[in-house]
Structure formats: C-alpha cells, structure tokens
C-alpha cells in the first residue's frame, strides 16, 4: 500500500515538475530589466531562451525571435540544450512510469518488470530534474556575471557590444519556475526509485516437505512459491490510485545586456 502511494505520488510530483520545466523553457521572462536604482524607463525589457521582448508603457508588447543559430552565445545554446534534454528525458520517464504504475494492469506484466520500469523512470526523472536545475543555474550565473559588467555607454552582453545606455537584467520568473520544477522532478524521481525497492519481488524458494497426516498417506508438495506482494491474481485489498495532477501554466508575452541577435 505504501509502495503504491509512493509510486503514485512520485509520478504526480514528476508530472507537475515536467510541466513546470516545459513552462519555464517556453517562458519569455528568463531575464527581466532591473528596475531598482535605475532611470525610470517607458519600456520594460525581458528575455527568454527563444526571443526577447519589450513592453512599452502603452501596453504594446513586441517580441523578436533569435533567428540566428550560429550567432548565439555558447552558454545560451547550452542552457537550451539542457532544458530540452530535461524535457525529453522527463517525457520518456512519464511514458515509462505510466506502464510501471501498480494500479495499472497491462497483460501479465510481472512485478519485476514493473520494478525495473519504475527504477528506469525514476532515474530519468532525476536526470531530467538535474538538467533543468543545471540549465537554470547556468543562466542565472550568466545574469549575475553580466549584472556587474556595467560601464557608462557600453555593455558587453551575451550578444556583443552596442553603443547604448546600460540596461541591467535580473532574474526573471522563469528561473524560479525552472528551479522549483526541476526540484519537483528530482523529488518525484527519488520517490520512484524508493518505490522500486518495495516493488522488487524477493525470490524465496521453499523445499518440498512431506506432511504425514495420521491415517493418510498424502504428501503435500508446495513447490517453489513466490512471496506474495498482494497483487498478481489476488485482487483482495487492491486500491486503484487516482492521481489527478492539474497544472495551470500561464505563459505571458507582455518589459540590452543580453541581446542575443
């Protein structure tokens, strides 16, 4: 029962985490214009992994995609790669874990197979979470480094030099979403790995024993029984786990140091 709950909870937590990683990857607010101790501007600049946006005081928002691939800095490419790898691994992990759930019956799949699948998905979730955390952390480090590189009329952003007034960027909402989502995916993966240990069947072979009942010459030979896990053909005390994860990801496209184009 505890194993089922752990596995189900791990799945739901990972599902939320991966949804969060996808949301963070798609969000435009990875870095946002630092408003503290800066001149009050009539525009608000913010940037994501795929495009940079400017929201004017009128509410008009204009976004420009980074249409170049070779012109983009290696660090940005690395962050993109880490987030995509995290999403792909997470998606595969989710697919595997669905079939590994104890509450879902697929043919005559043995518990050992389910245990292996649970472990596989757990490892995938852990790696996925680590990828997301690493990607977000690399970007955050990039922001911190660039934040202090400020001179009067020139900046060395992630995309080169432009003669312009210094615009400093700070952590955007996507970074926090990414960190939390990566953490949840990691926790979900650990829970799946823990559940795997409880799922793994222990092979216990009982040797044939002759029971001589008085007045009878009947020998009972039980043979090699597997330790019952409460599932298999025994449907007594079977509980279907219903994990309904609901995520509401609001991706806003509303406001340089990091003009990637």
């Amino acid at each position: 029962m505890a194993v089922t709950a752990c596995q189900g909870l791990g799945f739901v937590v990972s599902l939320i985490g991966i949804a969060g990683i996808i949301a963070a990857t798609c969000m435009d607010q990875w870095s946002t214009q630092d408003l503290y101790n800066n001149p009050v501007t009539a525009v608000f600049n913010y940037q994501g992994l795929w495009r940079s946006c400017v929201r004017e005081s009128s509410g008009f928002t204009e976004c420009r995609g980074y249409f170049t691939l070779l012109g983009l800095p290696a660090m940005l490419q690395a962050v993109r790669a880490l987030m995509i790898v995290g999403i792909v691994l997470g998606a595969i992990g989710l697919l595997v874990s669905i079939f590994a759930l104890k509450c879902i019956r697929i043919g005559s799949m043995e518990d050992s197979a389910k245990a292996n699948m649970t472990l596989t998905s757990g490892i995938m979730f852990i790696v996925s979470g680590l990828c997301a955390i690493a990607g977000v952390s690399v970007f955050a480090n990039m922001l911190v480094t660039n934040f202090w590189m400020s001179t009067a009329n020139m900046y060395t952003g992630m995309g080169g030099m432009v003669q312009t007034v210094q615009t400093r960027y700070t952590f955007g909402a996507a970074l926090f979403v990414g960190w939390v989502a990566g953490g949840l995916t990691l926790i979900g993966g650990v829970m799946m790995c823990i559940a795997c240990r409880g799922l793994a069947p222990e092979e216990t072979n009982y040797k044939a024993v002759s029971y001589h009942a008085s007045g009878h010459s009947v020998a009972y030979k039980p043979g090699g029984f597997k330790a019952s896990t409460g599932f298999g053909s025994n449907t007594k005390n079977k509980k279907i786990y219903d994990g309904g994860a609901r995520t509401e990801d609001e991706v806003q496209s509303y406001p340089s140091k990091h003009d990637y184009v």
């Epitope: 940079s52 952003g157 615009t167």
Partner: antibody, heavy 120, light 113 residues
Framework: EVQLVESGGGLVQPGGSLRLSCAAS????????IHWVRQAPGKGLEWVAY????????YYADTVKGRFTISRDNAKNSLYLQMTSLRAEDTAVYYC?????????????WGQGTTVTVSS | DIVMTQSPDSLAVSLGERATISCKSS????????????LAWYQQKPGQPPKLLIY???TRASGVPDRFSGSGSGTDFTLTISSLQAEDVAVYYC?????????FGQGTKLEIK
Amino acid sequence: EVQLVESGGGLVQPGGSLRLSCAASGFTFSDYGIHWVRQAPGKGLEWVAYISRGSSTIYYADTVKGRFTISRDNAKNSLYLQMTSLRAEDTAVYYCARGGYDTRNAMDYWGQGTTVTVSS
Amino acid sequence: DIVMTQSPDSLAVSLGERATISCKSSQSLLNSGNQKNYLAWYQQKPGQPPKLLIYGASTRASGVPDRFSGSGSGTDFTLTISSLQAEDVAVYYCQNDLYYPLTFGQGTKLEIK
C-alpha cells in the same frame, strides 16, 4: 474620430487649487494611457504627468510632484488633473494627450487645451 | 533628466527647398532590448495643439506627408522636410520617449525665406 476635450481652466490665485478634466471620445478610453502636457505662454512644451490604462502606473514631472494628482474614470471616459498649491510658473495651456498604442510611447492625439492662469 | 537640445532655434528656408532640424539627447534613446530609438517629432502651428509627425525616430505617423522624414540613432537625430510647403510653417519639437520624465526639445521655429 478621436477627440480629447479639456475643461476646468481659469484664473486662480497663488496657493489655490483647480481641477482640470479631459473628456475622451472616438476610441476605447480604457485601452490607452493618457498624458498631461503644458505650454507656458511663448514657451515650449513641458510634460506634466502620465497615467496608464488601469491607473496602475502614474508618473509626474519633478516640478509638480506632490502638488498635482492625475486620475481617470474609465467608466466616464474621463481624465483629471487635480492641481493644488498653484504657483505663477504653473500658468500655461494644459493639453491632455493620448499615448499611442504602437507609436513607441509617442502621443498620437492631443486636445485643444485649457488655459490656467495663476495670478494675484 | 534627459536633456533634449534642438538646433537651430529658428530656421528660414525657401519654398520647395530642403529644411533640416537637428536634435541631440543627453543620453542614448536607443533601447537595447529591441534596438529601437524612442524619439518623436511634433509639429505645432500657431494657436493649435502639437501634432505627431514622426515616432520611433523614423516612422511617419498616419496622415503625415512623405516629405517629412526622420533619421538618426542613439543621441543624434534629424527631421528633414524634403520640399518645404507654405503649410509647414510651424514650431517643431523633438521628444524623448524612453525615460521618465518625458522631455521635449526647446523647439525650432521654421519660417519661409
């Protein structure tokens, strides 16, 4: 047709108060930020204040900060400028101007203006 | 505050000739986020409110004749009237649209020679 009509100007003594109004028509008022800009006699344009669509963002020129209050009533399609502690240097024609939506923050439509005279 | 300086203060040009007004800002009006310049030009005729001519340093507002053009980037901007017409007699103002408080140039009075 976009129209902005200012009213409420007049003669007021130094230290006195006045409330200017700007009635908007011909466009969805609640979709636009509005500015007050003034022009002293024979002088250039001076930006006074700005209020965003939903009144969440308000900015003032340093010369009027603490004395003037900009507000709006989207239900009435109206903009207001409450002026207190008026000084002689506040004498000017006051214009309300619409902040264009996709005009890089430029003011695309202006009212005809209302004259405020601060004199004893 | 951003200081906008226009030159000349007044300008007399013959009908059909080119008129050029310059505007300099104390800080760059180029927003690095979108590589756009936040500078506007206004025309004010006597007894009338200002009228938007150019925004974003070079984009003509709707209904503005194509003889009006804007150019420049960063801190240096220019308004050009390719062939001066009688109705172009007015005072022209440049304006910083990037930083609050929004600031105007002192104005350039354009007259016919």
